[in-house]
Amino acid sequence: DPVKPSRGPLVTCTCESPHCKGPTCRGAWCTVVLVREEGRHPQEHRGCGNLHRELCRGRPTEFVNHYCCDSHLCNHNVSLVLEATQPPSEQPGTDGQ
């Protein structure tokens, strides 16, 4: 059940998000999430994961990229990018005319 919390050994992660108590957190895995809200600059958040491990397997989109790792402070220096959006004229399979 992906909603059930992980009860395995905990890892210490860098925590940089509006949900952090302090600069590190302890969780089942470490996360980096890059999110872009409509009309705003992307924001990168680092923290801990305990639930919804399936998010780690999601493919990057133009709005969100979710990265997970399992070792001590492994999310500290990770930088993510969003999937580039291609204007209709540049999409594969069109000749651009």
Partner: antibody, heavy 113, light 111 residues
């Protein structure tokens, strides 16, 4: 869009009970720790309690521990605060908050005889 | 009496820079992140600063936060009339195992 909507406030006599609810929408509720914070009329903010993502860990401010109980139902995207043995000094607007960014508009609890 | 100490009031004229201080201890500000909230009259608090000095998207860069030791401060530059509000600092307290707030600072923008 993140939305938190509190309900359940009202007028209650000293010694009485109330259960506040906070309906969450616009985000994956089960991924976030949640808090209750209160604000007495004309006063500052006071943290009441918090609960982790799956409800297994709860923390309370000392003055309310034993009288107040925080809980959540992730299947209903709802946070609760059960308040017992209410006192006049519990009169306040009670805010539901996603830790530590979004807040609801609050629900007023008035304890008076 | 609040665990975190803030001045009860502050003021400035439009265009000025004002700073609001927040003093705590080693168990809260000294070891954890500082958050700042703005509460306009009759509304819920809004997050201005998280992680000592980071702004959520949508918060103007006129607002900035800093932390040194067991104290923190919020600076507002290019003061505007709509900045008139109550400002609260907050942090997690490891000793109390709970969130603590400052008493709030009422900011007045003078004409």
């Amino acid at each position: 869009e993140v939305q938190l909507l509190e309900s359940g406030g009202g007028l209650v006599q000293p010694g009485g009970s109330l259960r506040l609810s906070c309906a969450a929408s616009g985000f994956t509720f089960s991924s976030y720790a949640m808090s209750w914070v209160r604000q007495a009329p004309g006063k500052g903010l006071e943290w009441v309690a918090n609960i982790n993502q799956d409800g297994s860990e709860k923390n309370y401010v000392d003055s309310m521990r034993g009288r107040f109980t925080i809980s959540r139902d992730n299947s209903k995207n709802t946070l609760y605060l059960q308040m017992n043995s209410l006192r006049a000094e519990d009169t306040a607007v009670y805010y539901c908050a996603r830790e530590f960014d979004y807040w609801g508009q609050g629900t007023l609890v008035t304890v008076t005889s | 009496q609040s665990v975190l100490a803030q001045p009860p009031s502050a003021s400035g004229t439009p265009g000025q820079r004002v700073t609001i201080s927040c003093s705590g201890s080693s168990s809260n500000i000294g070891s954890n992140y500082v958050y700042w909230y703005q509460q306009l009259p009759g509304t819920a608090p809004k997050l201005l600063i998280y992680g000592n000095n980071k702004r959520p998207s949508g918060v103007p860069d006129r607002f900035s936060g800093s932390k040194s030791g067991t104290s923190a401060s919020l600076a507002i530059s290019g003061l505007r009339s709509e900045d008139e509000a109550d400002y609260y600092c907050a942090a997690w307290d490891d000793s109390l195992n709970g969130r603590v707030f400052g008493g709030g600072t009422k900011l007045t923008v003078l004409d």
